[in-house]
């Protein structure tokens, strides 16, 4: 913008100015209307100097000046006068050049600022955004890492609680375990004690035990020589009285029978007059060893040699070839025969097998062969059995044809397996069989479901096992 | 103690599907053969399908086969027998039994019934219009 201004400062000069956008100029003149008179030396209108001067050497030297100043005054007012008369002219003519040359220049520097300004901003634009961006992302990671983090932290709070508890709940059991600890061994010593005692009471027993046993077969076995020898002799008496109360007899004495007093089975001792049924002694055929079995004298007519019986687990059947070749167990309970035994036996006349089972129902069932026998050791006592008939099923439980004997340290059977080890107990197993009367024996409510239980299959079915069992064998000709 | 259990047993009619299931706990599977059995009323119980080493190997009677498919699912120890096509022959109570799987004749692929010690109680499948 421009603007031309006149106005009067301070000191009564008149002044003045030439505004043009921030630019301004003032022009300062001299009034000659404000000069004094004369009349005093010290009221010229003189230059004041800095000190007067003396008043002999300066009278001369005012008169001229005087006289220059009068000229001056008068120049000057003419000056002023042409001044004012073309200062409206010459004002207009200056603003006009001075604000043409500003504007020229003003435009010049303007553009180059706007030019500049413009080019400020544009980089200052970028780099707002830029920084925008830059905050924006940092604002959603900042967010995104306070979610993270207070996640985390909930977590780590929940981790801990739960540590807390299980650190309690550790803290309750272990103290628990100590005190189960602390009554179990205190439990587990009072048992010791009483194993201990009760090791001494049943070796004592045991020992009682067999003493009673041989005293009661000697005692049977007395018995039966006893009622022999009273049957001898009431037939001899008979036979003397006979004699006596004929008149026609001759003298003679009565041949008595040499005493039989060695059974090679329970059939023999049964036909020799006892019939009670109990523990015997048998001697194997063509030898003097002697065995210990359980007679049946009860069961369809007696003479029964009992082979195996099973009843309430005592015994443990899961045993070596040795021990089912030799025999186990007690005739009065649980016990194996023998196999040598047996095939020795079987090998020499013809015998029946009777198999007598018990189910845990109150249920009784047997199955009766009327030819069996077992090869010998170098056969692996293989089985041999025909004729069945009976109530235990239709169908032989025992496979046929006969599978050789196995046990836990002899696997003699047809099966990829080894059926001793699987269905425990030494037996005929085939692969592995619908029978094994040798298995665990299972109490009641245990005893279904069994994998290697007391299995007599064409009764029971598969998976049960039973109660008791007992196997015997006869002569066929009893 | 080792159980089976049988289930999806019910009446269909001829030409449908039916789907048994039995699971089974006190054994694993990897160790063991299942199979399914079937008995008609007044009949013989008579293996239908059997399943061992993973469902390596399975068997069919020859009156299913085509028809019926065994199959098994470790991780759950459960064994099933999809049976399609279902005939009014087919009516009977099927059961599941178990037998360890080493109990093998040599030579035999599969295993008589009465080597499945484990039976479940079985369920009734009634196949009429």
């Known amino acids: 913008y421009s603007n031309f201004r006149k106005s009067v400062d301070s000191t009564g000069r008149r002044q003045y100015q030439v505004q043009n956008g921030p630019c301004s100029y003032t022009f300062l003149l001299p009034e000659t209307d404000s000069c004094r008179s004369s009349s005093s030396p010290y009221m010229s209108n003189a230059v004041q100097r800095d000190a007067p001067l003396d008043y002999d050497d300066s009278v001369q030297r005012l008169q001229v000046l005087e006289n220059i100043l009068e000229n001056n005054t008068q120049w000057l007012m003419k000056l002023e006068n042409y001044i004012q008369d073309n200062m409206k002219k010459e004002m207009v003519e200056i603003q006009q050049n001075v604000v043409q040359n500003q504007t020229a220049v003003m435009i010049e520097i303007g553009t180059s600022l706007l030019n500049q300004t413009a080019a400020q901003t544009r980089k200052l634009t970028d780099v707002e955004a830029q920084v925008l961006n830059q905050t924006t992302r940092l604002e959603l990671q900042l967010l995104q890492h306070s979610i993270s983090t207070n996640k985390l932290e909930k977590q780590i709070l929940d981790q801990t609680s739960e540590i807390n508890k299980l650190q309690n709940k550790n803290s309750f059991l272990e103290q628990k375990v100590l005190d189960m600890e602390g009554k179990h061994s205190e439990q587990l010593q009072s048992m010791k004690e009483q194993k201990d005692e009760l090791q001494v009471l049943v070796s004592k027993q045991s020992s009682v035990i067999d003493e009673l046993e041989k005293k009661l077969v000697t005692a049977t076995v007395n018995n039966s020589l006893l009622q022999k020898q009273q049957h001898d002799l009431m037939e001899t008496v008979n036979s003397l009285l006979t004699m006596m109360s004929s008149p026609n007899s001759k003298s003679s004495v009565a041949i008595r029978k040499e005493e039989q007093t060695t059974f090679r089975d329970c059939a023999e001792i049964f036909k020799s007059g006892l019939t009670t049924s109990g523990i015997y002694t048998l001697t194997f055929p063509n030898s003097t060893e002697e065995i210990k079995a359980y007679c049946d004298m009860d069961v369809g007519g007696g003479g029964w040699t009992v082979i195996q019986h099973r009843e309430d687990g005592s015994v443990d059947f899961q045993r070596t070839w040795k021990e089912y070749k030799e025999g186990f167990g007690s005739p009065l309970g649980e016990y194996w025969l023998g196999n040598e035994f047996v095939s020795q036996l079987t090998g020499q006349h013809r015998y029946v097998l009777k198999i007598q089972l018990k189910d845990w129902e109150g249920n009784e069932a047997h199955s009766l062969y009327d030819h069996f026998y077992l090869a010998g050791e170098e056969s692996n006592y293989r089985i041999h059995l025909t004729g069945l008939t009976g109530t235990a099923g239709k169908i032989s439980s025992i496979s046929q044809p006969g599978s050789d004997f196995s046990t836990k340290d002899s696997d003699n059977d047809k099966c990829i397996c080894k059926c001793s080890q699987m269905l425990s107990g030494g037996w005929w197993f085939d692969a592995c069989g619908p029978s094994n009367l040798n298995g665990q024996y299972y109490p009641q409510k245990q005893n279904t479901n069994k994998f290697n239980g007391i299995k007599w299959y064409y009764w029971k079915g598969s998976g049960y096992s039973l109660k008791a069992t007992t196997m015997m064998i006869r002569p066929a000709d009893f | 103690e080792v159980q089976l259990v049988e289930s999806g047993g019910g009446l269909v009619q001829p030409g449908g599907s039916l789907r048994l299931s039995c699971a089974v706990s006190?054994?694993?599977?990897?160790?063991?053969?299942i199979g399914w059995f079937r008995q008609a009323p007044g009949k013989e119980r008579e293996g239908v399908s059997s399943i061992r080493d993973n469902g390596g190997s399975t068997y069919y009677a020859d009156s299913v086969k085509g028809r019926f498919t065994i199959s098994s699912d470790n991780s759950k120890n459960t064994v099933y027998l999809q049976m399609n096509s279902l005939r009014p022959e087919d009516t009977a109570v099927y059961y599941c039994a178990a037998v360890p799987a080493g109990r093998l004749r040599y030579g035999e692929q599969w295993y008589p019934i009465y080597e499945y010690d484990a039976w479940g109680q079985g369920t009734l499948v009634t196949v009429s219009s």
């Open positions: 006190g054994i694993t599977l990897d160790d063991y053969a």
